[in-house]
């Protein structure tokens, strides 16, 4: 959910900290486009909803990438 | 601990120039993105400016659009406000701030102000 | 651009009483709103965020509530170190972020 139908991109910060993947309830992996030139991740957390983003360059968050990915490979036939 | 720290702030005339600085510490700089908020003697809180993690993006007041430029520079820790043009309604007490690292605007730490004061 | 107005502008209780804080928009801000306390001298202190999620570090008698246009900052019991002034700040549809004008919570 873009922050405002006038900036640009969501994450105006973003976080280096590892995440739990069992506290995820969702991960959005925004692409770069027109209107945010850069790829977003943004987790929201099962505990208050809270939406937090990810430093798509960390190497914890693309470690829970990989792991969301196996997650979900494992779930489809 | 984490730390904001301003500087910059004098007494200066109309139509003149100043440049406010945020030496930031105890956190990781370059992941947040920062603001910078002011009040005004006696007065509540204005939103002045605010700057992307990474310096992509940058956003202004319209009361100082075109006048004011928000920069940070992550490999020294600095937040930066480049004033010009200032007015008397300028005068205030200006904060730097740290946008919260959720997906949401909100300052969570604020250094403890400078004043400017724009008189002749 | 989004206004936010705070009532009362004063609140005159005595420690130990609920404050119950009002801010009101002049649009819908969905849940974007956050709220500050400011004490003489200081720079302000971030409470809650997301109208409804504490910051870190806040003790649990302060909460937030409401959405679209009206929220509420409650303290359930005030403590000597709460009589300050507090601000509401929207980040809907921004720029501008705009603050209310704050209410001061002051020893009756």
């Known amino acids: 959910v873009p922050l405002s139908r006038t900036v640009r991109c969501t994450c105006i910060s973003i976080s280096n900290q590892p995440v739990n993947p069992r506290s995820l309830e969702k991960l959005e992996i925004i692409p770069a486009s027109q209107f945010c030139p850069r790829v977003e991740i943004i987790a929201t957390m099962k505990k208050k909803g809270e939406k937090r983003c990810l430093n798509p360059e960390s190497k914890a968050i693309k470690n829970l990438l990989k792991a969301v990915s196996k997650e979900r490979s494992k779930r489809s036939p | 601990q984490e730390q904001l720290v301003e500087s910059g702030g004098n007494v200066v005339q109309p139509g003149r120039s100043l440049r406010l600085s945020c030496a930031a510490s105890g956190f990781t700089f370059s992941t947040y993105g920062m603001h910078w908020v002011r009040q005004a003697p006696g007065k509540g809180l204005e939103w002045v400016a605010v700057i992307w993690y990474d310096g992509s993006d940058k956003y202004y007041a319209d009361s100082v659009k075109d006048r004011f430029t928000v920069s940070k520079d992550n490999s020294k820790n600095t937040l930066y406000l480049q004033m010009n043009s200032l007015r008397a309604e300028d005068t205030a007490v200006y904060y730097c701030?740290?946008?919260?690292?959720?997906?949401?605007?909100?300052?969570?730490?604020w250094g403890q102000g400078t004043m400017v004061t724009v008189s002749s | 651009e989004i206004v936010l107005t705070q009532s009362p502008a004063i609140l005159s209780l005595s420690p130990g009483e609920r404050a119950t804080l009002s801010c009101r928009a002049s649009q819908s801000v969905s849940s974007y709103l956050a709220w500050y306390q400011q004490k003489p001298g200081q720079a302000p202190r971030l409470l809650i965020y997301d109208a409804s999620n504490r910051a870190t570090g806040i003790p649990a008698r302060f909460s937030g509530s409401g959405s679209g246009t009206d929220f509420t900052l409650t303290i359930s019991s005030l403590e000597p170190e709460d009589f300050a002034v507090y601000y509401c700040?929207?980040?809907?549809?921004?720029?501008?972020?705009?603050f209310g004008g704050g209410t001061k919570v002051e020893i009756k």
């Open positions: 700040q929207q980040r809907s549809n921004w720029p501008p972020l705009t």
């Open positions: 701030a740290r946008n919260i690292a959720v997906a949401d605007v909100a300052f969570d730490l």
